[in-house]
Amino acid sequence: CKAMHVAQPAVVLASSRGIASFVCEYASPGKATEVRVTVLRQADSQVTEVCAATYMMGNELTFLDDSICTGTSSGNQVNLTIQGLRAMDTGLYICKVELMYPPPYYLGIGNGTQIYVIDPEPCPDSDF
């Protein structure tokens, strides 16, 4: 039995289309069959849930249809993509991993990824 470590990149820059992707990797201390991955946003010590997905090991993780997140899983690694980001969404995004089944339950929390979002400049009117 040992603590679960979660690793994620320190900084990610969102694309001009407001899409940010990063990898969340966890060192699984047990043989989990059911894993829950949650993306949290922390701003001024307030924590809110961005999205969450539960998946069975070996299967793909599925976020709800209305979620702004998509992702794929491979072993102890989850590739997360957050869409629809705007400049006001710049902030610290924390990857939380929970090994739900079988017992014991494990909780791992990453240090967070600072996602920078820059709204694209509006196209100038062209005179022809």
Epitope: H5, R36, T38, V47, T48, I94, K96, L107, G108, I109
Partner: antibody, heavy 118, light 108 residues
Framework: QVQLVESGGGVVQPGRSLRLSCAAS????????MHWVRQAPGKGLEWVAV????????HYADSVKGRATISRDNSKNTLYLQMNSLRAEDTAVYYC???????????WGQGTLVTVSS | EIVLTQSPGTLSLSPGERATLSCRAS???????LAWYQQKPGQAPRLLIY???SRATGIPDRFSGSGSGTDFTLTISRLEPEDFAVYYC?????????FGPGTKVDIK
Amino acid sequence: QVQLVESGGGVVQPGRSLRLSCAASGFTFSSHGMHWVRQAPGKGLEWVAVTWYDGSNKHYADSVKGRATISRDNSKNTLYLQMNSLRAEDTAVYYCTRGELLGHFDYWGQGTLVTVSS
Amino acid sequence: EIVLTQSPGTLSLSPGERATLSCRASQSVSSSCLAWYQQKPGQAPRLLIYGASSRATGIPDRFSGSGSGTDFTLTISRLEPEDFAVYYCQQYGISPFTFGPGTKVDIK
């Protein structure tokens, strides 16, 4: 604001059953793990059980395993603890507490006292 | 299960003094998953510190937490009259979640 209100405690004879309830308000209930923690008179805190999110996963302390069932009704924002085959050592104040998104227990109810005595 | 040991069992101090409370785990605990609670007689516990060192909302800055691995500390820099209470550490990284036996801080 977040509120947790326990009910259902009382005096019960050894071997009998009791169901505790915890009415939650002021937050998105289904996004949080919900726990029961108990405290015997003059003693420390003991974690009892947790039910996660949609209620499909539950974990228990060894001291109540096989005798306790934790459940939740997300449509009613209510947490339950069914305790069977009660023993004198189950006498305690039972607290309902919310698992914050980062895992710690940030809000607690006022507690409900369960006394197991003949 | 992870066993948490707190020391001392009782700490007798005067208002204005510094209090240092220790919590030791039987095996390594993620610092993201260690909390401290304060409890006064007849009241529910109150969250003070989470993630080993982050102060909960509304907690005065005289309370601070530190540590990693198996050794964690709660420090109260200058005791106020309302700080005399029992303090519990807790790990919430692995089930069963466990609390330490508590340290009572009383008035000398």
